[in-house]
């Protein structure tokens, strides 16, 4: 009985031979749990896993902490691949994050962090980056130093109120800061003026919602 | 859908005064905060006042502290920015812009920019002789 080959990452899937975008499965080492991610093995060379997506507003991103660690949605559509399996992957060696954006006038820009990781649930999951570079503002929309994760019922922001509730999703909220890819989806000349929407403040300004995003991880120096 | 249109700007001679209008819509005053901005050709946009809490809490910056003062009427949806002693310097395209009042960071009274999610389009105010 042959060994079973398995892949922590797209970018293990790539340099394994298979080089064509699609869903793959994935298994962290020594683990037996298995997610299902979009890997992009066309974009700036390829191996990207694919960890969140929204594009038409099909799925519903006001999801409780435990969707949000264990991931929802299609990934071959929307989804959250899920912080549990990202924290780990990223505690385990260096990852690149790169957020690629899509505004309604056919506009496009990205941000690349040249380090990423989550903490772990303990730790609500904290967001840490480095280095940031790319079109889609100089200065980064995901609050610095990161924020912990919260969910609509799981408040770990440092606001009076509770964004995750008053803005829709799960993100790293700071008070509640200049960026939620998770926001409502609202569709094209609906979508300024949003106080909930999908914003990313240093490249389209407030109350913006986007037409499309992908946050895609890849080990530093793939 | 909401909206915020201002209104009141014109061309005003140094000392003069004028008073610009922010009618809201699509929302109601009581539970967010309205903040006054401006920006000048060439320079970044910054703010000037702001009102939440039914005029129960307001904010000035120190360049207008003492000339401009800011209020509503909760039931016109409006708020207002009553500017005096106007000089060269306060010419701008002035815009209001609203965020929920609950937006706030533990321990602090005032929203950075960012959390401003909604947007008039502005009213152009000169000052000149």
């Known amino acids: 009985k042959g060994e079973q080959i398995s892949f922590r990452d797209c970018a293990e899937v790539f340099k394994s031979g298979h080089t064509t975008n699609g869903v793959y499965t994935l298994t962290l080492p020594n683990s037996t749990e298995e997610v299902k991610a979009y890997c992009d093995m066309e974009a700036g060379g390829g191996g990207w896993t694919i960890i969140q997506r929204r594009e038409d507003g099909s799925v519903d991103f006001q999801r409780t902490w435990k969707e949000y660690k264990v991931g929802f949605g299609n990934p071959s559509g929307e989804y959250w691949l899920g912080n549990e399996f990202v924290s780990q992957l990223t505690n385990q060696q260096r990852y690149v994050l790169k957020i690629h954006l899509k505004d309604w006038e056919g506009n496009e820009a990205y941000s690349l962090y040249e380090h990423f990781y989550l903490s772990s649930e303990e730790l609500n999951y904290r967001i840490h980056l480095k280095g940031l570079t790319g079109t889609a503002g100089k200065i980064s929309s995901i609050s610095q130093p990161g924020n912990d994760f919260s969910t609509k019922d799981a408040d770990n922001d440092k606001c009076i109120c509770k964004c995750s509730q008053m803005l829709t999703g799960g993100w790293w909220f700071d008070a509640c800061g200049p960026s939620n890819l998770n926001g409502m989806y609202y569709p094209q000349r609906q979508n300024t003026n949003k106080f909930n929407g999908i914003k990313w403040y240093y490249w389209k300004g407030s109350g913006y919602s986007l037409k499309g995003t992908t946050m895609m991880i890849r080990p530093a120096g793939f | 859908e909401v909206q915020l249109v201002e209104s009141g700007g014109g061309l005003v001679q140094p000392g003069g005064s004028l008073r610009l209008s922010c009618a809201a819509s699509?929302?109601?005053?009581?539970?967010?905060?309205i903040g006054w901005f401006r920006q000048a050709p060439g320079k970044e946009r910054e703010g000037v006042s702001a009102?939440?809490?039914?005029?129960?809490?307001?904010y000035y910056a120190d360049s207008v502290k003492g000339r401009f003062t800011i209020s509503s009427d909760n039931s016109k949806n409006t708020v207002y920015l009553q500017m005096n002693s106007l000089r060269p310097e306060d010419t701008a395209v002035y815009y209001c812009?609203?965020?929920?009042?609950?937006?706030?960071?533990?321990?602090?009274?005032?929203?950075?920019?960012?959390?401003?999610?909604?947007w008039g389009q502005g009213t152009l105010v000169t000052v000149s002789s």
């Open positions: 009102i939440r809490d039914n005029g129960g809490s307001t």
């Open positions: 812009a609203a965020v929920p009042a609950g937006r706030l960071r533990f321990g602090e009274q005032w929203y950075p920019l960012y959390e401003y999610d909604a």
């Open positions: 699509g929302f109601t005053l009581d539970d967010y905060a």
